[in-house]
Interface confidence: low
């Protein structure tokens, strides 16, 4: 557990009147329909709200849509619905905001049937103006903005078109027909597939997967019978159909398509899938379904070259039907992932790994609950996480995990302790180590958001009745006190903090209801005068990050490498402040064979870290190329884990074989690659 | 209880090797590193090395580099130290150590240092023509 | 490599008195030393560790302080038994050193 001090509530003094002066009530001037809402830019305090409102009449359906902007964090609105001429929005599209901190805004509006093309509304100054534009196409998605130029934009038309500006929106180009799918790559690159013959579902398997590097002005075509592909980290992913039959298989490349590798996992029929489920620069977790409406499959994990792939996890819980997964990243913690898996009597189970998916593990008992029903031994069980899953199920679970990078160590979940995910209503539950340790933070199920990079912590009871009450806690959820916002109840809807979990300001959002109309409200709440000063060196602790024992010399390693970080006492109501960077010191540790996987080839037996030959791959399902061509591979039959930096200590060498005799793929021959140009 | 038990005494000829064995007992043999300590004949002592049972990595001190060897067996719990190329100043007592902690390889050491507080024997290697 | 100093090298002393040795570190080590005793024909035995714990079964009589690159031993009234020698190690970098050693002498 990360460092506590004394479990006594220190309460914060006056803390009402420090709140009562920084509440900020907003009713817009609207009937209830929808509300959406976007941050633009990153520390601008700059807040979207679009309201949409559908009359249903007896031939069409009359809409009306409002544009409110706040530069505030919230704290105050003005109706900006004017600046795109009183133009119902499209929600389906929502706002397309630009990356970082572009300032740049995309509005999609409803046109008449019978118009050439649709309309959108472009902002480059942070939603202060906004410029109509006609498009000459009706646009199937909403706009994607290169990660690199946020002048160039691409959009997919209702007629399967590929469209390219280069301008914001200003001027639209067609650069290619019949495309399925289409995906901004680096450096400016799109990819995309192609339907020969009827449409994007006939065709499919039979799909050709495109690239151009200069906005359409020249194409290449980088693959052939593609079902359909996916880009991770540095990997593009394709799963691709058998020559023989109606399977498919994976082929990944690193070098934008030019050249392919078959990745070694199992190929799958027409009802299975592959799901990338997280990808960095060093690796990526691979999903396979499991053959026959099962509801699971098997995690992989892949090697540097996302080519090799060793097992990580059995009957994970991925559903054909919603595609529900409960994967999750912690994102407070390197190397920490939970999800669910089905177990054999069909009941779902959380699982936690602490190192990339090398090992998986139950997630310990909380100290402060007694195991429940689902428990067999009432003294031994395990805490089970709610996730995407429990939420699809419509369990009373308002909210997904939550973690945030600058937060180190905070997970809060809903959660049940037993021997599996229980129906009875959650609690939430809290880890201060990054899901080595849980407590429960909150009895029921609640809505919860993180501030001020975890100095506070923000909770609304999960009520079907009118609420006026905010729960925040200044030690990591330890102790708790109520602030009630407002005399009047709201109806409420959800919590609103900006993303990266910087601000001191929470937004509150609901409606008041009466008997003859509804309306939208929110509620900002400023903590800034509860965090009074700034924090000072002594309002740190140092932690050690995944430490377990600290009496092994090796405590704490994980991936080769240690991390130390500078944690904010819980005892210390101060400010992190906006501008807040996590102090971490990472020293590297020796490498043992845990550092590294099997290469190609190799396997470890059971219960041995030593990698050993395959003494045959003939006829093995596991079928391995590099780059789709007989080649000239050799290994010593390890890999170093993608992302490890130990050094020294066990450095395993053995006699480099030469594996070109085993290798075949059935992918992209040379002469089907060909170059084209518009 | 809590014990390491070493090999017998080894009587040795320049440009030779010796491998000196540390069983250890009472406790879960993986959980704790082990550390090669040797005291030449009226001097103090001197760190060799150190293993982690657990996947076999280890570090040496750069003296000994390139002539140590520090191996383990988790089947029989035993920890192995050899060192090559023997010359005389090599006579020695060699003593393994039952070593809690390890090496924080840059920044501030990331906890307390418990000490060796388990320690063998010793093996008297008498290196001599 | 960090290289640990012991001073004196020889402490004489009547029993019943106190002791004090000394340990300086070439850098800092922060509290990441430890003190061990050692008898003629005898392994050491660890007396302090984390430059202030006493290891288990070690009488109170023994005592370690300091932190960073200075650390004392202090036997606070001399036994017969304690008379041995005594070393400081640092485990703060690796490689791990011992300091020289100091030995206490019936006076």
């Known amino acids: 557990s990360a460092p506590g001090e004394d479990e006594e509530c220190g309460r914060v003094r006056d803390f009402v009147a420090k709140l009562a002066n920084n509440t900020h009530q907003h009713v817009f001037d609207d009937l209830r329909g929808s509300v959406s809402l976007s941050w633009v830019g990153d520390s601008t305090g700059v807040i979207l709200v679009l309201t949409t409102f559908h009359v249903p009449l007896v031939i069409m359906t009359f809409g009306q849509s409002k544009l409110y902007r706040s530069e505030d964090y919230g704290k105050n609105f003005k109706d900006i619905t004017d600046l795109i001429n009183n133009t119902f929005i499209r929600t389906e599209f929502g706002m397309a905001i630009g990356p970082e901190n572009s300032g740049k805004v995309v509005l999609t509006a409803e046109v008449s049937g019978g118009s050439r093309g649709g309309r959108i509304f472009r902002s480059s100054d942070f939603a202060k103006n906004f410029v109509q534009t006609d498009l000459p196409f009706h646009p199937l998605t909403q706009m994607m903005y290169s990660p690199q130029n946020s002048d160039y934009l691409l959009a997919l038309s209702t007629e399967n078109g590929l469209w390219v500006s280069k301008n914001f929106g200003g001027k639209w180009e067609e650069i290619h027909k019949a495309v399925c799918l289409a995906k901004w790559g680096s450096d400016n690159t799109i990819f995309f597939t192609t339907y020969a013959n009827g449409s994007c579902k006939a065709d499919l398997g039979a799909l050709e997967l495109w690239r151009t590097s200069d906005l359409g002005k020249s194409f290449k075509t980088i693959g052939v019978k593609i079902y359909s592909f996916g880009l991770g980290g540095r990997f593009l992913f394709a799963s691709v159909m058998a020559d023989k039959d109606t399977t498919r298989r994976i082929h990944v490349s690193t070098d934008q398509g030019d050249t392919w590798s078959m990745a070694q996992l199992p190929s799958v029929g027409q009802e299975q899938f592959y799901s990338i489920l997280a990808a960095n620069d060093d690796m990526v977790f691979m999903h396979v379904d499991e053959p026959g409406d099962t509801g699971f499959g098997t995690i992989f994990t892949s090697d540097d070259r996302g080519i090799v792939y060793s097992k990580s996890l059995d009957r994970h819980l991925y559903t054909t039907t919603g595609g529900e997964t409960d994967f999750t990243n912690v994102t407070s913690l390197r190397g920490v992932y939970i999800t669910s898996v089905l177990s054999e009597d069909n009941s779902i189970q959380t699982m936690i790994t602490f190192d990339q998916g090398g090992r998986w593990t139950h997630l310990r008992k909380p100290e402060n609950s007694e195991c429940d029903a689902t428990a067999k031994n009432k003294n031994e069980c395990s805490l089970h996480i709610h996730a995407s899953y429990s939420i699809s199920q419509k369990l009373n679970v308002p909210m997904a995990p939550l973690s945030e990078p600058n937060a180190v160590g905070i997970v809060i979940a809903h959660g049940s302790v037993g021997d599996a995910i229980s129906v009875m209503v959650p609690d939430v539950y809290i880890s201060d180590d990054g899901g080595y340790s849980w407590t429960k933070m909150l009895e029921g199920p609640h809505y919860y958001t993180i501030l001020d990079s975890g100095g506070i912590i923000v909770a609304i009871e999960h009520s079907s009745r009118p609420i006026n009450v905010i729960k925040f806690s200044t030690d990591e959820g330890q102790c708790w006190q109520t602030y009630t916002f407002t005399r009047d109840p709201i109806y409420f809807t959800g919590l609103a903090s900006e993303p990266g979990a910087r601000s001191m300001n929470i937004s509150i959002w609901g409606f008041t209801e009466s008997f003859l109309t509804s309306q939208w409200v929110s509620y900002t709440i400023d903590f800034k005068d509860i965090l009074e000063r700034n924090c000072e060196e002594k309002d740190y602790t140092a932690w050690l990050a995944h430490s377990t024992d600290p009496e092994d010399y090796e405590d704490g390693c994980i991936l080769g490498y240690k991390e130390q970080f500078l944690r904010l006492r819980k005892s210390s109501v101060c400010q992190n402040g906006r501008d807040y960077v996590v102090t971490k010191q990472p020293s590297i540790c020796l490498c043992s064979l845990e550092d590294f996987l099997c290469d190609f080839g190799y396997y470890r037996p059971e219960n041995d870290s030593k990698c050993v030959e395959q003494p045959e791959l003939k006829g093995h399902d596991l079928e391995f190329c590099l780059y789709g061509r007989e080649e000239h591979l050799t290994t010593n039959g390890y890999r170093k884990i993608p992302g490890d930096k130990c050094q020294g200590g066990v450095n395993p060498v053995r006699e480099v074989k030469d594996l070109k005799k085993k290798c075949t793929s059935n992918f992209l021959s040379p002469e089907k690659q060909n170059s084209k140009s518009n | 209880q809590v014990q390491l038990v070493q090999s017998g005494a080894e009587v040795k000829k320049p440009g030779a090797s010796v491998k000196v064995s540390c069983k250890a007992s009472g406790y879960t043999f993986t959980s704790r590193y082990m550390s090669w300590v040797r005291q030449a004949p009226g001097q103090g002592l001197e760190w060799m090395g150190i293993?982690?049972?657990?996947?076999?990595?280890?570090s040496y001190a750069q003296k000994f580099q390139g002539r140590v060897t520090m191996t383990r067996d988790t089947s029989t719990s035993t920890v192995y130290m050899e060192l090559s190329s023997l010359r005389s100043e090599d006579t020695a007592v060699y003593y393994c150590?039952?070593?809690?902690?390890?090496?924080?390889?840059?920044?501030?050491?990331?906890?307390?240092?418990?000490?060796?507080?388990?320690w063998g024997q010793g093996t008297t290697v008498t290196v001599s023509s | 490599e960090i290289v640990m100093t012991q001073s004196p090298a020889t402490l004489s002393v009547s029993p019943g008195e106190r002791a004090t040795l000394s340990c300086r570190a070439s850098?800092?080590?922060?509290?990441?030393l430890a003190w061990y005793q050692q008898k003629p024909g005898q392994a050491p035995r660890l007396l302090i560790y984390?430059?202030?714990t006493r290891a288990t079964g070690i009488p109170a009589r023994f005592s370690g302080s300091g932190s960073g690159t200075e650390f004392t031993l202090t036997i606070s009234s001399l036994q017969s038994e304690d008379f041995a020698v005594y070393y400081c190690q640092q485990a703060r970098l690796g490689p791990w050193t011992f300091g020289g050693g100091t030995k206490v002498e019936i006076k």
């Open positions: 150590a039952r070593d809690p902690s390890g090496i924080a390889a840059a920044g501030p050491a990331s906890r307390y240092y418990y000490g060796m507080d388990v």
């Open positions: 850098q800092s080590v922060s509290s990441n």
């Open positions: 984390g430059a202030s």
């Open positions: 293993i982690n049972p657990v996947g076999g990595s280890t």
